[in-house]
Interface confidence: medium
């Protein structure tokens, strides 16, 4: 399922963003899935669908529930559901760990704090930012764009930062404050040809005609922050995007892990609806960075029915 | 193995700008990742900025965040970077770098090119 978890705090803004990927030209519709009620798309209701967002202006705790979104193209249809929660404000400080962001790990060379989202948002500087709920201040800390970037960083910097700012639309002014964690390494990374854990090589996956596969292409990196390091599929040496196959999509944005220290990326290649067809297609993971490109290869064969019978 | 050639390169002054083109001898529609790499006097061989074939994502090495930005027309089989704000540390010779898909190689190195002078004084 094409699913995304987002969270606000009431009477905030909170914008979310259909996770079906489709052009600008395609029109999306968005629905509220308990009731299968259309939102309405009129900027004049607290809540309004604006193409592949889906507005809260501001938040209330009764939005919580599952939003579906459907990209409607010429040719197809694509669904996606978003997950939506919305929480009182805490009367103390602690943020809790249901409404934290990724964390981020820094090194004294790397110390940028990006600000969960703010991408979706119409905002303008200045942003600011808290630590563990105290604003931040003196000339180590330097609030640059969309991020927070921190001199000479120690092991002390650890910790939970927030960042607030306002989303202006169409004149009113909402607030929006978004918290992730942040830690400190103090070892040296270093970079490697990649290694991918996921596919093995010529790898034969079994799958269900009709029914849905995932792939999952993992690889590793190195140590620490990498400059350039990613993964993708290729279906018969062709960018998934340029295959043509709407069942057939790269889950979107690659999920970062760090495991035994190691920088690790991995990402998902989702078949809807398994066909024949399908059977006859080269998948291949790709691995890339600053040192080249491993691939694996991996084919998909029909998976046998269990006879029941004796 | 592509042949890769750059241009662009010259002398400019601190603040100014230059755009280096990457010209493919092959076709780079299929190309995995293409980038810029630079090389300072008595340095080693650095990553500046790259782009990967699939979606377009870009990666930028942090001291040219905000100042360089990559692209690839893959109609004319070229790579270009834009440097805006040039400082006097950007002066190296920078080398386009390709990694395309080969069916019949797993593990691929890159395929580079000569290199082109970029030089930032007044």
């Known amino acids: 399922k094409f699913s995304k978890q987002s969270w606000g705090l009431e009477n905030e803004a909170l914008i979310v963003r259909c996770p079906r990927q489709g052009k600008p030209s395609y029109t999306v519709d968005w629905y509220y899935s308990q009731t299968n009620k259309s939102i309405p798309t009129q900027e004049r209701n607290r809540v309004f669908a604006s193409g592949q967002l889906l507005k809260f202006l501001p938040a209330a705790v009764a939005d919580s529930g599952i939003y579906t979104c459907i990209v409607r193209s010429p040719t197809f249809n694509r669904t996606g559901y978003a997950n939506v929660t919305i929480y009182k404000k805490q009367s103390d400080c602690n943020v809790p760990d249901y409404l934290m962001y990724s964390t981020v790990s820094g090194s004294e060379k790397n110390s940028k704090i990006y600000c969960p989202t703010i991408d979706l948002y119409n905002w303008t500087a200045p942003l600011e930012w808290f630590k563990n709920c105290q604003a931040l201040q003196g000339s180590r800390y330097r609030a640059h764009k969309s991020f927070l970037v921190i001199d000479n960083v120690m092991t002390e910097d650890a910790g939970d930062y927030t960042c607030k700012f306002i989303h202006n639309e169409n004149g009113a002014n909402y607030s929006v404050t978004a918290t992730r964690s942040f830690t400190v390494k103090d070892e040296q990374g270093f970079s490697l040809f990649p290694v991918i854990g996921a596919p093995a090589q010529n790898e034969i996956k079994e799958v269900e005609i009709g029914k849905n596969a995932n792939l999952t292409c993992s690889a590793c990196f190195g140590k620490g922050t990498q400059f350039l390091a990613a993964v993708l599929w290729q279906l018969n040496g062709t960018k998934i995007t340029d295959f043509g196959e709407p069942r057939i999509q790269q889950e979107e944005g690659q999920n970062q892990s760090f495991s035994n220290g190691l920088a690790c990326l991995d990402m998902v290649l989702r078949i809807a609806d398994v066909k024949e067809e399908d059977l006859l297609l080269q998948y291949d993971c790709l691995a890339l960075n600053l040192h080249g490109l491993r691939r694996h290869t991996v084919r998909l064969s029909r998976k046998n029915p269990i006879d029941h019978h004796s | 193995e592509v042949q890769l050639v750059e241009s662009g390169g010259g002398l400019v002054q601190p603040g100014g700008s230059l755009r280096l083109s990457c010209a493919a001898s092959?076709?780079?529609?299929?190309?995995?990742?293409m980038g810029w790499f630079r090389q300072a006097p008595g340095k080693e061989r650095e990553f500046v900025a790259g782009i990967i074939g699939s979606g377009g994502a870009t990666y930028y090495a942090d001291s040219v965040k905000g100042r360089f930005t990559i692209s690839a027309d893959n109609s004319k089989n070229t790579a270009y970077l834009q440097m805006n704000s040039l400082k006097p540390e950007d002066t190296a010779v920078y080398y386009c770098a390709a990694s395309r898909y080969a069916r019949e190689r797993d593990v691929h190195a890159y395929d580079w090119g000569q290199g082109t002078l970029v030089t930032v004084s007044s």
């Open positions: 092959g076709t780079i529609t299929s190309a995995v990742f």
